[in-house]
Each structure stands twice: as C-alpha cells, then as structure tokens.
C-alpha cells in the first residue's frame, strides 16, 4: 500500500542530487588550491543531515551549521560582487574579473547553484517529487534557510567597497524581498564596509534613462545610509559592452562611459 | 597493478585488541575512501566499516561501534583497523577493500583477507 | 537478518539465465542509492561484478547485468557457466543506518 506522501508546490530534489554535490565539491577543491584539505565525503555527509529526516517546512539556520564549518573559506573582503536578480552576468563578470567573488565563486555556493533538495521527516528519504515553494508553502525549507544562511556570512565577511549588480529591467530594480534586500543589505558591517556601489544594469540597447534615479534604488541609498555605509550607484547602459571592457580594458572604445 | 595487502591478524583472547593494517599500491590512495568487511566462518559478507578519501567522515556497523576505530595513513598509503574488547563472534577474516571512489559506491578491489580468532 | 534480502540459492543449467534478486527499503536502494554486485568463488576474496546498478568493471563479461527498480535489484547471468560457481552478494549505502549494507548471499549452483 503506498504510503501518503506530503505534496509541495515547488519542483522536487534535483535529479541525482547526492552524485551532483559530490561532483561539484571534487571540481571546486581540484580549482582551488587553498580548498584542497576539503574532505567531499564529510561536506556531503553535513550537507545531507542539515535536511534529511527533517520536516521541510521546519529547517533552521543551526541545521546547517555543520557544513558552514566545513565550508568555511576566506575570500578577499574587499573584492565582493553582490547581485539581484541578475545572476548570468555577475558569473560572467567574475569568470573575467578573477579577483572579485559573486556568492556562487565560493564552495557553498558553487555546491548549490541552481540545485532543489529536501527530505522527509522522520525517514532518510530524499524526496524527489516535490519540495515546499517558498511563497506557497513555507519560507523555512532547506533551499531558502541555505541561501539565507550562505547569503548572511557572504555579506557578513565583506569590507572596504561592496558592489552589487542590480537588474534594471525589473519593475523593482530593488527589491526589498529579494535575498539581495532581504538578507545581503542588513548584514553589511558598517565597522568594516565603507561603501556600497550599485552598479544598474539596462535592458533595452536605448535605454540612456539615469536608473540611479529610480525610487526603488532611492528607497535601498535610504537604508544604506541609515546604516551608516556611504552608496553610490553607476549605469551600465551597454552590458556586452562592460563584459568586453573587462576583458579588453585597453580597448579605446573603453574610454567612454559604458 | 592495484593491491591491497591485510596484516596484523592472528589469535586474540576475548576482551583484547589487535590492529589491522592494509598496504595499498597501484593507485593514487588518497583520492578513494577505503573499507573493513569481514566473513565469519561459513557466512556471508558483513560490513565493518568505512573511511572516506581524505579521513574526515567515517562510518561503522552497529555491532562494532565503540570498539573498532577505521584510521588511514595518506602519506604510507596505509589503511588500518584498531580493534578493542573483541568478542568471539569478531571471529573472521577481515577483508581491506578500495571504495568505488565515495563510500556510498560500493568496493571495486579487494585484498585476499587476514584472519582474526578471538578465543581464550 | 540482512537489511538486503536474497534467496539463499539459486541454480541453473550450463547456456541458461539465470536471475539474483536483491530487495531493499526506502532507506537504501529506494532512495537513490547505487546498487553493486560482488561474486566470490569458493575460497577466494570477493569480487566487484556490477557497480553503480548496472556498470560492468572491465573484464566483467557481458553474460553479467544489474538492473534496479524501485526498492529492488536484480543481477542476471546469462550463458551459464560451470565456473559462475560461487555465492552472490548485493550491496548498497544505507541512509537510515548511515551504513553499508550486504545482502545474505545466494549459492549459485550450477547443475
């Protein structure tokens, strides 16, 4: 007799989750020299028990504790890009700009881009059908509370000036409900970052509108301000053109504003 | 040519120890996790337990928990087992094998076995 | 009592198939978890035949194949030979017990 089972609105655990984390977390230590002590198995053995046999609507911060150890990595403070709803270009400008860090250039987060997981409670199962929605069913399940927890420390480590690149595209070009506004921002240390510079970046090829206007990006200067932390913000009107700059700095066509 | 080669078997009374070791060449030893299974007299496999590649997770069977302690040695490409208040039902050969890469993935090599005899 | 179960024999005659059978829980092969195979001949250390459900190590011949359905496993040997002789083991991770877990064995005869 098959036995009920809870049906949640979000899609369910990745396909071969377990194989994929493994896989990840042996690419990124073979990458990365200072994370060659990392022992896969046991960050797969903290990442699993952070959620398996645990009520999906029910994870904490602390569930998750074992494998932020395991995880801990240093990265430059001072070289962080945040970014909001425009994750492909913040990872095309770190794959150029290797100094500067997105949270996905970190183990953790390489280890769970774009990845769906939860169990079960009470059985070792992973379940592979379905996984709570975080709108639908409930904000504390194991996707959510691990973005939330990576997010947090990321913003947490940085210092001097922070940028973030913002989706100008997007009705709300801040969103207060975004992990970006939601988490990133209010974990800024104003003891340690000095400035966060937003960088906005357009849409439409003849999009020359000062974005930096945009109430939206007033209403997230107001709340950096309040927490001490000088803002800035700059429009990138050409992103291919900035991604080619990066790349290409001598280029003469770079001199003019991008 | 991979080969894993078990010692430090013999004769034990019960309630005392012994330590196996298990010589791997081959391979490159610390990119897999290694694991004890042992085979009573007439009986089938029984798993002991498991190490992953580098030594920071480990696994044991229920009934061997608190007295077995799975160790490994990277830089001697050597696995071991410490084996305390044995028991007469310890009584096997102890087989070292080469993990199919993860411990989850089952053994690809194994080694020709050393015996244990708890008896007094 | 294995966590895996299989029957305890098994036998066939010489060019017949025959089929091992491996059955499991949620908990271990119903959750995603590899299946592998091992044969042991009389008197010898036991043997990798199928990794990863169905993968054959090289020099496994083809006569040997694993699949897996559900919380279940099978190993199929087709061609039988005198010297398939030997007893079968299943195996796979077990998530509950965070253990690896064997089944009892099958003796294949060969009539």
């Known amino acids: 007799v098959p036995r009920w089972r809870q049906q949640w609105s979000g899609p369910g655990t990745t396909k071969r989750f377990p194989e994929t984390v493994l896989a990840r977390c042996v690419k990124y230590t073979e990458i990365h020299p200072e994370m060659r002590h990392v022992d896969c198995q046991s960050v797969w053995d903290a990442f699993k028990g952070a959620f398996i046999s645990k009520h999906p609507c029910n994870i904490t911060e602390e569930d998750y504790q074992p494998l932020m150890k395991l995880g801990t990595q240093t990265v430059p403070c001072n070289k962080i890009l945040l970014w909001s709803r425009i994750k492909d270009l913040a990872h095309q400008f770190t794959q150029v700009q290797r100094d500067m860090f997105t949270l996905e250039d970190t183990l953790l987060g390489y280890l769970a881009d774009d990845l769906t997981w939860c169990g079960e409670f009470n059985t070792s199962k992973i379940n592979y059908q379905s996984c709570p929605d975080w709108r639908k069913d409930c904000s504390n399940n194991p996707v959510s509370v691990f973005w939330k927890t990576v997010s947090r420390r990321f913003a947490e480590a940085a210092c001097d000036v922070v940028h973030v690149m913002l989706n100008g595209s997007r009705s709300k070009i801040f969103d207060k409900n975004s992990t970006f506004g939601s988490v990133e921002v209010h974990n800024l240390q104003p003891e340690k970052v000095q400035t966060l510079e937003a960088w906005v970046i357009h849409g439409g090829r003849e999009d020359s509108r000062d974005l930096c206007q945009d109430p939206t990006i007033k209403e997230l200067e107001s709340i950096i301000s309040k927490r001490n932390i000088q803002f800035s913000c700059k429009n990138i009107y050409r992103p291919d053109k900035f991604l080619q700059c990066v790349k290409n700095p001598e280029d003469s066509s770079c001199t003019s504003e991008i | 040519e991979v080969q894993l080669l078990e010692s430090g078997g013999g004769l034990v009374q019960p309630g005392g120890s012994l330590r196996l070791s298990c010589a791997a060449s081959g391979f490159l030893f610390d990119d897999y996790g290694m694991s004890w299974v042992r085979q009573a007299p007439g009986k089938g496999l029984e798993w002991v337990s498991a190490?992953?590649?580098?030594?920071?997770?480990?696994y044991y069977a229920d009934s061997v928990k608190g007295r077995f302690t799975i160790s490994r040695d990277n830089s001697k490409n050597t696995l071991y087992l410490q084996m305390s208040s044995l028991r007469a039902e310890d009584t096997a050969v102890y087989y070292c094998a080469k993990d199919h890469k993860w411990n989850y993935y089952g053994m690809d090599v194994w080694g020709q076995g050393t015996t244990v005899t708890v008896s007094s | 009592q294995s966590v895996l179960t299989q029957p305890p024999s098994a036998s066939g005659t010489p060019g017949q198939r025959v089929t091992i059978s491996c059955s499991g829980s949620t908990s271990n092969i119903g959750n995603d978890n590899y299946v592998s195979w091992y044969q042991q001949l009389p008197g010898t250390a036991p043997r990798l035949l199928i990794y990863?459900?169905?993968q054959r190590p090289s020099g496994v011949p083809d006569r040997f194949s694993g699949s897996k359905s559900g919380t279940s496993a099978s190993l199929a040997i087709s061609g039988l030979q005198s010297e398939d002789e030997a007893d079968y083991y299943c195996g796979t991770w077990d998530d509950r017990l965070n253990a690896w877990v064997f089944g009892g064995g099958t003796k294949l005869t060969v009539l």
């Open positions: 990863k459900d169905d």
């Open positions: 190490i992953s590649y580098k030594g920071g997770s480990t």
